[in-house]
């Protein structure tokens, strides 16, 4: 089966790599613009130069292209705790990330929020905090994991999932009490 190609891909595939079909004359292949530039005017004829101009401040193109406009630079979302790792250049978008001892949680493909890495108090670090994943904690006996924190089993209510984890501890306490009454 031949994969379905969009009009732009169809036009580009007629020309060799690094070139694109002239939109008004499909017998002409124009050279694409380098990254950091955009298409100002198509090449006037075969073997003639494409008129490419450098992206203005606040915009970029990260690969060779025949875009009529550069892409706007992304802004890091301060309200989500994001910080700028590297600023936008004509050939690279802004890179946003999190501070030290924080990780990214992606709410969607293009939206992340920075959260503090868990310290695993009353537990041990099973897996260290990574760029896109919080620390994985293992809780000490008498504690259970809730929202990635080790919480005392004394806070475990019967209706909660923690009953399975805390039950041996509760039985242990009862057993100790019983043995002390003889």
């Amino acid at each position: 089966l031949v994969p379905h190609l969009g009009d732009r891909e169809k036009r580009d595939s007629v020309c060799p790599q690094g070139k694109y079909i002239h939109p008004q004359n499909n017998s002409i292949c124009c050279t694409k613009c380098h990254k950091g530039t955009y298409l100002y005017n198509d090449c006037p004829g075969p073997g003639q130069d494409t008129d490419c101009r450098e992206c203005e401040s606040g915009s970029f193109t990260a690969s060779e292209n025949h875009l009529r406009h550069c892409l706007s630079c992304s802004k890091c979302r301060k309200e989500m705790g994001q910080v700028e790792i590297s600023s936008c250049t004509v050939d690279r978008d802004t890179v946003c990330g999190c501070r030290k001892n924080q990780y990214r949680h992606y709410w969607s493909e293009n939206l992340f929020q920075c959260f503090n890495c868990s310290l695993c108090l009353n537990g041990t670090v099973h897996l260290s905090c990574q760029e896109k994943q919080n620390t994985v904690c293992t809780c000490h006996a008498g504690f259970f994991l809730r929202e990635n924190e080790c919480v005392s089993c004394s806070n475990c209510k019967k209706s909660l999932e923690c009953t399975k984890l805390c039950l041996p501890q509760i039985e242990n306490v009862k057993g100790t009490e019983d043995s002390g009454t003889t």
Partner: nanobody, 119 residues
Framework: EVQLLESGGGLVQPGGSLRLSCAAS????????MVWVRQAPGKGLEWVSH????????YYADSVKGRFTISRDNSKNTLYLQMNSLRAEDTAVYYC????????????RGQGTLVTVSS
């Protein structure tokens, strides 16, 4: 005690409009980034939109961009979501929430309001 109460949901035809409201109390509303999330039947929570404390910074999921508008009135402690050009896939329970701070879960969110888009 933090309280968030959504209203404005209902049945609407495709292409129609609705305006959701969220009345907030029990915290300093004007200091908080607020979020609209939704849950379609049988699906997980989807981040729809958020607005910063001052109302100057907004975000929209690609699925609602150009159709939904988030706003707030800090004098009334109320968050809004204007929904235009509604589609069947917008059918969901819509919740307003405070931006999570401790981790990726919602400590504070409302009970939700059901939006049904159907002809």
């Amino acid at each position: 005690e933090v309280q968030l109460l959504e209203s404005g949901g209902g049945l609407v035809q495709p292409g129609g409009s609705l305006r959701l409201s969220c009345a907030a109390s029990g915290f300093t509303f004007e200091n908080k980034t607020m979020v609209w999330v939704r849950q379609a039947p049988g699906k997980g929570l989807e981040w729809v939109s958020h607005i910063d404390a001052t109302g100057t910074i907004t975000y929209y999921a690609d699925s609602v961009k150009g159709r939904f508008t988030i706003s707030r009135d800090n004098s009334k402690n109320t968050l809004y979501l204007q929904m235009n050009s509604l589609r069947a896939e917008d059918t969901a329970v819509y919740y307003c929430a405070l931006l999570p701070k401790r981790g990726p879960w919602f400590d504070y969110r409302g009970q939700g309001t059901l939006v049904t888009v159907s002809s």
